[in-house]
Amino acid sequence: KSPIFGPEEVNSVEGNSVSITCYYPPTSVNRHTRKYWCRQGARGGCITLISSEGYVSSKYAGRANLTNFPENGTFVVNIAQLSQDDSGRYKCGLGINSRGLSFDVSLEVSQGPGLLNDTKVYTVDLGRTVTINCPFKTENAQKRKSLYKQIGLYPVLVIDSSGYVNPNYTGRIRLDIQGTGQLLFSVVINQLRLSDAGQYLCQAGDDSNSNKKNADLQVLKPEPELVYEDLRGSVTFHCALGPEVANVAKFLCRQSSGENCDVVVNTLGKRAPAFEGRILLNPQDKDGSFSVVITGLRKEDAGRYLCGAHSDGQLQEGSPIQAWQLFVNEESTIPRSPTVVKGVAGGSVAVLCPYNRKESKSIKYWCLWEGAQNGRCPLLVDSEGWVKAQYEGRLSLLEEPGNGTFTVILNQLTSRDAGFYWCLTNGDTLWRTTVEIKIIEGEPNLKVPGNVTAVLGETLKVPCHFPCKFSSYEKYWCKWNNTGCQALPSQDEGPSKAFVNCDENSRLVSLTLNLVTRADEGWYWCGVKQGHFYGETAAVYVAVEERKAAGSRDVSLAKADAAPDEKVLDSGFREIENKAIQDPRLFAEEKAVADTRDQADGSRASVDSGSSEEQGGSSR
């Protein structure tokens, strides 16, 4: 018995489309072998019409496709513009047509509903507007105009020129009589529903001399576009509903059971909690089109999504919509990266950001997700030497460790740094990851003085105390600038006395600046790392002033100045929007990324006890 399964019978009508799903055991061999759809001949052969290797028969050219979904163990054959000639017996299968790994499918295409003579066919998408034109003769110019819908055997009045409107059409229909020159009236129906489809009759006059015109209204439900994205990757839904709804609230919803469509995000400010920190609704264009980016795709994000327009900001009957069926591929090319990183006030975090290793020369960015309105992500730093003014001295983007990962270090943490951050590049838009920074109770591990003042021409020594937990780490001092942090020579001064209950493995490592110049003014960081993986950092601002009295300065923890006030948010922020970054690809085809793995290591980053994987930026 063949393990392939599918629909035994498919019935449709001319002009329609069908999507035939065939199920197979998702073994490694099956997932990668050829998939086919063939038509059985009278003599028993089976002629391939379409296969997963790219073959498409001339009979199917331009109207069929075959899509494999390997992790689900399914493939789908879509056939459009059906005709009665398509009726017959088919097989969907794996491997070679004659080899029995197949399932028999009977497709029956019947003739569409017959139309009366002189019937005008209107084919309109769900939620859109149709205008049914009804000509009449001069003798009926002053007589009653009406539109009827054929329900079974009986015509039911929909609207007439005396002001009647059928309750099913209230608020969305009007009858327009053209100027005296034109012998035409028209009925405009908005927010079309599936139930509006059918045969209509428009009439001018009520007697035997009345003018009649038949109309057939076909309301098309949008076929969902199949979207196939990687776990931890991102998806962008581009929604173009037309200028007629440019000023109507927009939404993206996800169909749950039955008829419900739960709002994911809308332009009225609603956002589903499951998408907090990983969704942006891109501003609409003048034509009413917009896009929604969802990053950090999860298995449970799979499903049918609808975008639409309605004043309520949610799906209602008559909303114009677009539809997508999202599949999330669990065999992802995107590596796991931490989704939660924890740090303490005054401490630091080091965030590892994955990117497509084929695009090592791409520009790297880090931005802060903001939930206000429809969500936005103002840039904080990039790999080209730009740092937002508010973050000078405490934020650095490093190309290390390279080969598909870059590092972002943020220190001098405050409670205001808690939130969601996105790692992204101007290259492959799939590779966008989201990380949440949480500020937890605790003390920074590294101890440095507060602000330090150096004297021109003199020597300055700045201490950094490392607890014993970092005994196996490389310790360093560096001078921060907006392109990174340039390493400086430092001296190991032996065990530190700054820690209680810490043995000889604690360390005091000093930075010495000889013959201080004005150029030495700025931010200095001490930190720990293992190879190219960075751990905790601490920052000190060194100010330079004129000589007052001779000698060198040796700064201790006790003499530390208070930390400087936080700098004010600069008004010239850059954010991830079409207009904000020179490279249009950043939001032209947005996609993104993220998954589990909290950052490890005490105050710099502690792990939830339930976390199965930890990132130790400082403990690799």
Partner: nanobody, 129 residues
Framework: EVQLVESGGGLVQAGGSLRLSCEDS????????MGWFRQAPGKERDFVAA???????????YYSDSAKGRFTASRDNAKNTAYLQMNGLKPEDTAVYYC???????????????????WGQGIQVTVSS
Amino acid sequence: EVQLVESGGGLVQAGGSLRLSCEDSGRTFGDYIMGWFRQAPGKERDFVAAISWTGDSTYYKYYSDSAKGRFTASRDNAKNTAYLQMNGLKPEDTAVYYCAARTFRIDYDPRTASTYNYWGQGIQVTVSS
């Protein structure tokens, strides 16, 4: 909320026929699938047949090996009702029959009971020899 109500079960002689009906309410949007499952005493709930449909007069019918050629799934959209016509009934068809429904998704196998959101209360079919 979708509610499913089965009817048409009962006692029948081997070789006889029954038509089960399953009326559903509450569905207004999206492609849909209605499955028929059966559970004999002390056994698992097994797939029998399913019918899925779109709003454009297109139907897809699925059958288990044991139902193939004997049972026919159908649907009357006007009545919001699905049917399972069972011919050539055998004693081994004796079971409680359930109808189940959900939005159609191509990554959900119609044969997998756990993918269905809504279930009827079940109806007894007994085939005597």
